[in-house]
């Protein structure tokens, strides 16, 4: 999916008002220096591509993020402010809602959410030069 047509300001507002708090809640009890940020993005569409991938694509050691509150809100934000997004994600979204398995927070998941926090911060500061 090409995130170019998204309403970035609305997504940013949703992140600042609610998604960021859910990410912090998920990471509670973890030191902010515990993980190094290894994933980066260069502009807002690229950041959303990376955020979407890290949030919804299962990875080795962390398969459960899609059912977290921050993920549900991310999905909803992309659906309503990125035209056509939800139609490209139909099967994944239906499966995500149907599967209500026990949530397991692994160290790998904490590391992944730490990367997500970095991507979201970068998304909110698009004019900063890439380090």
């Amino acid at each position: 999916y090409d995130f170019t047509n998204c309403d970035f300001e609305k997504i940013k507002a949703a992140y600042l008002s609610t998604i960021s708090k859910d990410l912090i809640t998920y990471m509670s009890g973890t030191k902010s220096t515990e993980f190094n940020n290894t994933v980066s993005c260069s502009n807002r569409p690229h950041c959303l591509t990376e955020i979407q991938s890290l949030t919804f694509n299962p990875t080795a050691g962390c398969a459960s993020l899609a059912k977290e509150m921050f993920a549900m809100k991310t999905k909803a934000a992309l659906a309503i402010w990125c035209p056509g997004y939800s139609e490209t994600q139909i099967n994944a979204t239906q499966a995500m809602k149907k599967r209500r398995k026990r949530k397991v927070t692994t160290n790998k998941c904490l590391e992944q959410v730490s990367q997500l926090q970095g991507l979201w911060r970068r998304f909110n500061r698009p004019l900063l030069k890439q380090q």
Epitope: A76, A79, I80, P83, S86, E87, T93, M96
Partner: antibody, heavy 120, light 107 residues
Framework: QVQLVQSGAEVKKPGSSVKVSCKAS????????ISWVRQAPGQGLEWMGG????????NYAQKFQGRVTITADESTSTAYMELSSLRSEDTAVYYC?????????????WGQGTLVTVSS | DIQMTQSPSSLSASVGDRVTITCRAS??????LNWYQQKPGKAPKLLIY???SLQSGVPSRFSGSGSGTDFTLTISSLQPEDFAVYYC?????????FGQGTKVEIK
């Protein structure tokens, strides 16, 4: 089966506001985007905006920005569309529409429509 | 805003005819194109989404094709219940916009 039932016809004076309701039944309400689409007499369809009730995320067409407010009450599975500063050109049938897929903005289910007449 | 232009605005056809309606977008919308049918005094009904995917419960005589800027809705064999107004709608950018409609009338 999903059903969307809208409030009855309204006659309003220019400059006033109207609030149309859309009650959903048959299935969960919160995770499905509700959009509002209007149709002036003998004219085509015009998307006004939408809401995802679960989180209150809204999106409005620029044309209606500042004049339309879309809200939802999860406890009653009802969405609302309020249009202010009414003028004669706002005379139309107002439809609420919903997708059968989570968060989707497709319009697979429609309300029966609410005729709003703006006349002095 | 993306402009959607349908042609023809109206057409007359007989039961059993093959009918084709076209929709052109003012810019590339990939395959983010939906088709709706509306009968007098009724709400629209979704027929086709994603340019070519048939909505559940819609008869197979309806089909959609195209991508980019040019799209087609085809009714392979027109039935009495198909006389209605047909609208295309783009979902590639906000605001979501509709074509002006094509009225299919009985010849």
């Amino acid at each position: 089966q999903v059903q969307l039932v809208q409030s009855g016809a309204e006659v309003k004076k220019p400059g006033s506001s109207v609030k149309v309701s859309c009650k959903a039944s048959g299935g969960t309400f919160s995770s499905y985007a509700i959009s509002w689409v209007r149709q002036a007499p003998g004219q085509g369809l015009e998307w006004m905006g939408g809401i995802i009730p679960e989180f209150g995320f809204t999106n409005y067409a620029q044309k209606f920005q500042g004049r339309v407010t879309i809200t939802a009450d999860e406890s009653t599975s009802t969405a609302y569309m309020e249009l202010s500063s009414l003028r004669s050109e706002d005379t139309a049938v107002y439809y609420c529409a919903r997708s059968g897929m989570f968060y989707s903005i497709l319009f697979d289910y429609w309300g029966q429509g609410t005729l709003v007449t703006v006349s002095s | 805003d993306i402009q959607m232009t349908q042609s023809p605005s109206s057409l007359s056809a007989s039961v059993g005819d093959r009918v084709t309606i076209t929709c052109r977008a003012s810019q590339d919308i990939y395959n983010y194109l939906n088709w709706y049918q509306q009968k007098p005094g009724k709400a629209p009904k979704l027929l086709i989404y994603g340019a070519s995917s048939l909505q559940s419960g819609v008869p197979s005589r309806f089909s959609g094709s195209g991508s980019g800027t040019d799209f087609t809705l085809t009714i392979s064999s027109l039935q009495p219940e198909d006389f209605a107004v047909y609208y295309c709608q783009q979902q590639n950018d906000y605001p979501l916009t509709f074509g002006q409609g094509t009225k299919v009338e009985i010849k």
